[in-house]
């Protein structure tokens, strides 16, 4: 990678003191002659983050390899993207610095994000000054995403970018709607062209394993080392206050690299210098931490001390990142004190050792509790250690106990005991329990008592129709949750079995005992609709309905009619037990009541969708019956009726209704209205001679009242057949009476 560093001075109390410096460690950089290639360029990039125009910035060249930008007059001048371009020809490289305003509404938790191709990047903008408006995320200045202000999590707005690819790289920003763009949180996303640990055109080459936070360049496989580290794998720390690929540059000023942000060629990005952290790189590392942004932990051994710039400083006779390596005696490295494997597995166990002389494959062995010695089948030799790999024969319970890894060289020997626990995969002792069932699903409680060892990592539920030879269906579920088996056949028995697994390879146990679970009958799917209804009395309602026409047999046992009396909060249910029925008479209803009516098909205990509701108003109950009805024949075609008004009337009578019927006749009765409710007699005319008639009457207020007693009377003489009975007005009656 090109040796190019962009330094930003972050002492922001006075923008006029702010400066940016671009430093190149390349031979002859910045001289500008054809022989030495193009000069260093340092500029503000206004393509994405536009700031109000101000006085031009001053560019000063300091020798052949350094250029500085000054002349910032106000804080808003600082906000945005700055870039330094250096290197010649194919090596020409741009280094980018993104500056955020410390007073912005939103601040980035971390400005530079370097991720591998295919990773998920998460940009986090912390709320500094809240606004109750949308937050707009932009990518390279263009709209990208919106969040509602309610979507903040722990005072942060997160943008998740799954499966990122190199074109996703760029400047991202989070801004409150209506806020100045200068109040945005600005981020830089760098997506390496390869997955983790790989580089090259087809990402086929393996990275060298960059140390101390170095990042593997996806084009050339070199480590881009954090400021303050050098070496092909960044294994070596510079002296305090120095940076550059060969530690050749020195931080300006008496406080060293405090308050400086360092930006390096991609895919590194920007960070504080070694030994410093914080948004303005002014905080020293906490004890036990070191390196750029204090991201590394010392964990020094053998009396080593932690230096926040270089890491562990080892006492005489010890070396290694954590002072863990003796200069002579071999040593087993990083051996876990306890390992766990599942019964009947054939695990690989690694044992790493270092020393002087260097351990080789044959000098490392593994001893089982029964004394059997295993020799390694493979060894990986690295600059600081040898790792021997042992293929263990199929484990039995007797293999539980203390194993030992031993290394022997002419420099001495070392051994490390570690405990191996052989665990028995869990086997259910009981069948799963059915919780609820529907026509197409069963809800099952899968976790049962088991033999063998926990913890249970996964539960597999195997199921298939009873007596079936088809393959088992399998569902993997969370151990703590009930499981719903979906898309089953109605009215079908299923054989259901549980298989439990514990963590690790070979952790699957044998299947538990089966149980039979039967799905419910299918729920009716047809939605009826109400065709009509009519009132057959103050307390009687006849209802009719229809069903959609569908091919095949009707799934249903009958219908449920529901009448809801909202005023009284009462529901009346009427069961019609024939699926062929399309009408029903509802009796015993409350007169004068507003009912909501619907109908639904049922099958077994399951109800189908209800019809859209209808609203029905039953007429109120009418007045009591008229009293003392009496009939008197006047001629061969006339009969006079007399009566007394009903007692305890709830209101004024609107009319009387007389029912006339030939005694013993089969025809329908005739109803005649008496529209003068104050009267107590009327003459029925047009009757047939010598014919016996039955009479009864009732009063009407808002609704028709109760019938009176029935009276009989015959017309006189042998007259001609009349056209039919009619009611004579009171005036005529008075004339006859007189």
């Amino acid at each position: 990678a090109v040796d190019l560093t962009l330094l930003a001075n972050l002492r922001l109390t006075d923008p006029q003191r702010f400066f940016l410096t671009c430093v190149s460690g390349e031979a002859g950089a910045g001289r500008g002659s054809d022989a030495w290639g193009p000069p260093l360029l340092l500029e503000k990039d206004d393509r994405i983050v536009r700031t109000p125009p101000g006085p031009p910035l001053r560019l000063a060249r300091n020798g052949s390899h350094q250029v500085t930008l000054r002349g910032f007059s106000k804080p808003s001048d600082l906000v945005g993207v700055f870039s330094c371009v250096g290197g010649a020809g194919a090596r020409r490289t741009r280094v980018i610095y993104v500056h955020n305003s410390p007073g912005a509404h939103l601040l980035p938790d971390k400005v530079t994000h370097t991720v591998n191709k295919g990773d998920t990047a998460v940009l986090s903008a912390r709320v500094h000054k809240e606004k109750q408006t949308d937050v707009i995320w932009k990518s390279n200045g263009s709209y990208f995403y919106t969040l509602d202000w309610h979507e903040a999590q722990d005072g942060r707005f997160l943008l998740q970018l799954p499966n990122v690819q190199p074109p996703s790289s760029g400047i991202y920003s989070a801004t409150y709607l209506e806020a100045s763009p200068l109040g945005s949180a600005f981020f830089r996303l760098i997506v390496r062209g390869c997955g983790a640990g790989r580089w090259g055109p087809g990402c086929t080459k393996e990275c060298p394993g960059c140390l101390h936070g170095g990042v593997c360049h996806d084009h050339d496989g070199e480590c881009v080392c954090p400021p303050g580290f050098t070496g092909t794998r960044c294994e070596q720390a510079c002296r305090e206050g120095r940076f550059g690929q060969s530690c050749q540059e020195q931080c300006p000023g008496i406080s060293g690299c405090r308050g400086l942000t360092f930006c390096l060629p991609d895919p590194y990005g920007c960070s504080c210098g070694s030994g410093w952290r914080g948004s303005q790189c002014q905080e020293a590392c906490a004890p036990g931490h070191f390196g750029a942004d204090c991201r590394l932990q010392c964990q020094c051994q053998n009396g080593g001390t932690c230096d926040r710039f270089s890491g562990c400083v080892c006492p005489s006779g010890w070396h290694g990142v954590h002072c863990e390596k003796s200069d002579r005696i071999p040593q087993i490295l990083n051996m876990a004190s306890e390992l766990e494997f599942n019964l009947e597995t054939m695990p690989r166990i690694n044992c790493a050792a270092a020393g002087n002389p260097f351990p080789v494959r044959g000098s490392i062995e593994l001893r089982k509790p029964d004394g059997t010695v295993l020799l390694s089948t493979k060894a990986i030799v690295e600059p600081e250690k040898t790792t021997a790999e042992f293929e263990v024969p199929r484990l039995v319970l007797a293999d539980s106990g203390f194993w030992e890894c031993r290394v022997s060289t002419s420099g001495g020997q070392d051994s490390r005991r570690f405990k191996v626990n052989v665990k028995v995969p869990p086997v259910p002792l009981a069948a799963p329990r059915l919780l609820t069932k529907q026509s197409r699903q069963l809800v099952v409680s899968p976790l049962v008592s088991f033999s063998g060892d926990g913890p249970i990592s996964t539960v597999r539920l195997h199921y298939r129709p009873q007596d079936s030879t088809m393959d088992w269906s399998t569902i993997v579920v969370d151990p703590s949750e009930n499981v719903t088996l979906m898309n089953l056949r109605p009215k079908t028995g299923y054989s259901v079995r549980v298989q439990l697994s514990r963590p690790g390879e070979g952790g699957e146990g044998a299947w538990g005992p089966p149980t039979l679970m039967t799905t419910d009958c299918p729920e009716p799917l047809l939605q009826p609709w109400l065709e009509g209804w009519h009132v057959e009395g103050t307390d009687r309602l006849r209802v009719s309905w229809s069903l959609p026409l569908v091919p095949g047999p009707l799934v249903g046992d009958g219908f449920l009619l529901r009448l809801w009396d909202g005023t009284r909060g009462q529901e009346r249910r009427e069961n019609v037990s024939s699926p062929q029925a399309r009408t029903a008479l509802l009796t015993g209803l409350t007169p004068g009541t507003h009912y909501q009516l619907d109908v639904q098909l049922y099958h077994c205990t399951l109800l189908g969708p209800a019809s859209p509701p209808a609203h029905v108003l039953l007429p109120p109950s009418g007045p009591p019956a008229p009293r003392h009805l009496h009939a008197q024949a006047l001629s061969d075609s006339e009969i006079q009726l007399t009566w007394k008004h009903p007692e305890a009337l709830p209101g004024p009578i609107s009319k009387y209704v007389v029912e006339v019927q030939v005694a013993g006749g089969a025809g329908d009765p005739l109803w005649i209205d008496v529209d003068r409710p104050e009267e107590t007699s009327t003459i029925i005319r047009g009757l047939n001679a010598s014919t016996r008639y039955l009479f009864r009457m009732r009063a009407s207020i808002q609704g028709l009242g109760d019938w009176s007693n029935t009276v009989e009377e015959s017309t006189l003489g042998n007259g001609l057949q009349a056209e039919g009975p009619v009611q004579e007005s009171r005036a005529a009656e008075e004339g006859l009476d007189q």
Partner: antibody, heavy 122, light 107 residues
Framework: EVQLLESGGGLVQPGGSLRLSCAAS????????MNWVRQAPGKGLEWVSV????????YYADSVKGRFTISRDNSKNTLYLQMNSLRAEDTAVYYC???????????????WGQGTLVTVSS | DIQMTQSPSSLSASVGDRVTITCQAS??????LNWYQQKPGKAPKLLIY???NLETGVPSRFSGSGSGTDFTLTISSLQPEDFATYYC?????????FGQGTKVEVK
């Protein structure tokens, strides 16, 4: 080319339910706010609901609150409107419209579907 | 909720006329207002966004102005294809609200 295609409209009785869908193509659906806007026959436009890209935040017009539910399936590039307890006054052409803020922070319903007619009648 | 009052509800004009439609918000909505045109049987079309910005592809005879509570859509010289219904929309807060619409008819 951006396309929004509504479906699922039709005749439904008062109190009934209907689910409208809007299939989107030609843009990164999962990054945009989506709206439903309706227009009763012979009447003006009425904004109904919005859902944010994550699907985690929604808003509704008072006239439909508690009855309508907006949702989205970003994996299928589809917007939905579940309408329950329908009333005669919900009869309208329902449009889906993508809403976004451009890089200057200006909001626009720039893309609209052709609409689907919902008729609520007994 | 912010109410939007659009006037007039309809107007008759001739080709070449200057037409002005106003929209009044019940409270300050800054510049968060768009104007739309709708023709019968068609979806609305964005004309002006953020009170005064002309949408790409919209003829320059359309212009928008105003801020706060009072906004205006102006068609400097009415063309035959401009006979339609016009709506304003506030997007300052939820619920979003359209104006009642202004129908521009042939005189």
């Amino acid at each position: 080319e951006v396309q929004l295609l509504e479906s699922g409209g039709g005749l439904v009785q008062p109190g009934g339910s209907l689910r409208l869908s809007c299939a989107a193509s030609g843009f990164t659906f999962s990054n945009y706010k989506m709206n439903w806007v309706r227009q009763a026959p012979g009447k003006g436009l009425e904004w109904v609901s919005v859902i944010y890209p994550s699907g985690g935040w929604t808003y509704y017009a008072d006239s439909v609150k508690g009855r309508f539910t907006i949702s989205r399936d970003n994996s299928k590039n589809t917007l939905y409107l579940q309408m329950n307890s329908l009333r005669a006054e919900d009869t309208a052409v329902y449009y889906c419209a993508s809403g976004y803020y451009d890089s200057s922070g200006y909001s626009r319903f720039d893309y609209w579907g052709q609409g689907t007619l919902v008729t609520v009648s007994s | 909720d912010i109410q939007m009052t659009q006037s007039p509800s309809s107007l008759s004009a001739s080709v070449g006329d200057r037409v002005t439609i106003t929209c009044q918000a019940s409270q300050d909505i800054s510049n968060y207002l768009n104007w739309y045109q709708q023709k019968p049987g068609k979806a609305p079309k964005l004309l002006i966004y953020h009170a005064s910005n002309l949408e790409t592809g919209v003829p320059s005879r359309f212009s928008g102005s105003g801020s706060g509570t009072d906004f205006t859509l102006t068609i400097s010289s009415l063309q035959p294809e401009d006979f339609a219904t016009y709506y304003c929309l506030q997007y300052k807060s939820y619920p979003r609200l359209f104006g009642q619409g202004t129908k521009v008819e042939v005189k």
